[in-house]
Interface confidence: medium
């Protein structure tokens, strides 16, 4: 009875894992809108997928309440510093909830990447990664914003991405 019970338990755990919501969204040419809105993401092609979560205009939409590990990485780079660049770049994950009219900060990082340009080479690279566990209710949304988004380098789906999975 013991071995059979543990086998059933393993199968049950595997089944529960299979339905655990998860998503990994990747950067695409259309990610940077110039509109001041959140970054947009590829949801199907290449490494991107949605399972048990939905997507709408840059937002991952939670369909099942629970604790989620949410994450985002953005690749930053440029030649020299862009005109009008603020002193710091903000990369953040923000929550939208029907219970509150404004986006709520969940995870935010700030950096001053342009300083990496040198007199001998104006080319610079930097990146920002955010990740953490948060509780999300059904219907709540998570978005990624980068100010100044003009610094985000996309190239392929491996450099800048956004995802979540239930823990």
């Amino acid at each position: 009875d013991g071995p059979a019970g543990s086998w059933e338990q393993l199968i049950q755990e595997r089944r529960s894992h299979e339905v655990n919501p998860a998503a990994h969204l990747t950067g695409a040419n259309s990610s940077l809108t110039g509109s001041g809105g959140p970054l947009l993401w590829e949801t199907q092609l290449g490494l991107a997928f949605l399972r048990g979560l939905s997507y709408h205009d840059g937002a991952l939409v939670v369909t099942k309440a629970g604790y989620y590990y949410i994450y985002s990485k953005v690749q930053l780079g440029g030649v020299g510093c862009p005109l009008g660049l603020a002193s710091t770049i903000t990369h953040g994950l923000y929550k939208r909830t029907p219970r509150y009219p404004e986006e709520l900060e969940l995870l935010v990082s700030q950096q001053s990447p342009c300083g990496r340009a040198t007199s001998s080479s104006r080319v610079w690279w930097d990146s920002s990664f955010l990740g953490g566990v948060v509780h999300l209710e059904a219907g709540e949304e998570v978005v990624v914003r980068v100010l100044d988004e003009r610094l985000v380098r996309l190239r392929d789906g491996t450099r800048s991405y956004f995802g979540a999975f239930m823990v």
Partner: antibody, heavy 121, light 111 residues
Framework: QVQLVQSGAEVKKPGASVKVSCKAS????????VHWVRQAPGQGLEWIGA????????SYNQKFKGRATLTADKSTSTVYMELSSLRSEDTAVYYC??????????????WGQGTLVTVSS | EIVMTQSPATLSVSPGERATLSCKAS??????????MNWYQQKPGQPPRLLIY???NLESGIPARFSGSGSGTEFTLTISSLQSEDFAVYYC?????????FGQGTKLEIK
Amino acid sequence: QVQLVQSGAEVKKPGASVKVSCKASGYTFTSYNVHWVRQAPGQGLEWIGAVYPGNGDTSYNQKFKGRATLTADKSTSTVYMELSSLRSEDTAVYYCARGSYYYTSSYFDHWGQGTLVTVSS
Amino acid sequence: EIVMTQSPATLSVSPGERATLSCKASQSVDFDGDSYMNWYQQKPGQPPRLLIYTASNLESGIPARFSGSGSGTEFTLTISSLQSEDFAVYYCQQSYEDPFTFGQGTKLEIK
């Protein structure tokens, strides 16, 4: 549609200053750099500098630094280019042009009609 | 600064034929897989008009007979079948770093 409308032709004496305006419409004024480019009669194009109307940040061609001043007025969506200590070789058509949104690729997708500045004693 | 050199200075081509214009930069204008080279057309009494950006991207509203190619320091603008309205002066421009510089222009004239 995007439009850049410049002020009219000017005739100035050597040593004087000129201020050319460029009124933008049809897009979010504070999101795009506005560049200034000049073209002497029968000659090629020369970049003077650019201003980011969002915060007034400027970048200048070293050749014009100290003589050219670029400013932006958000309330009227107008950019100005002032050139001081004019000399005869500054006689040219001066263009304003909208820069692309992505800063690393500063191509100029919309241009003003040009303002002829003549410097003559 | 980056010096842009266009050739030839004048190109005489018959309508319907292909035109190939060249532009060389004094140093590479490539970054992260993109080439920061742009092409403009200018007709007398008019401002320049953007044709091609980042070496090979056709600006909206520009006919498909215009195409751009190249990378590093060498770039080409090709007009596949010349129309009467294509006879003008063409400028290349680098946007890799400021000061943003233009070539001296290639005048495309009717043969």
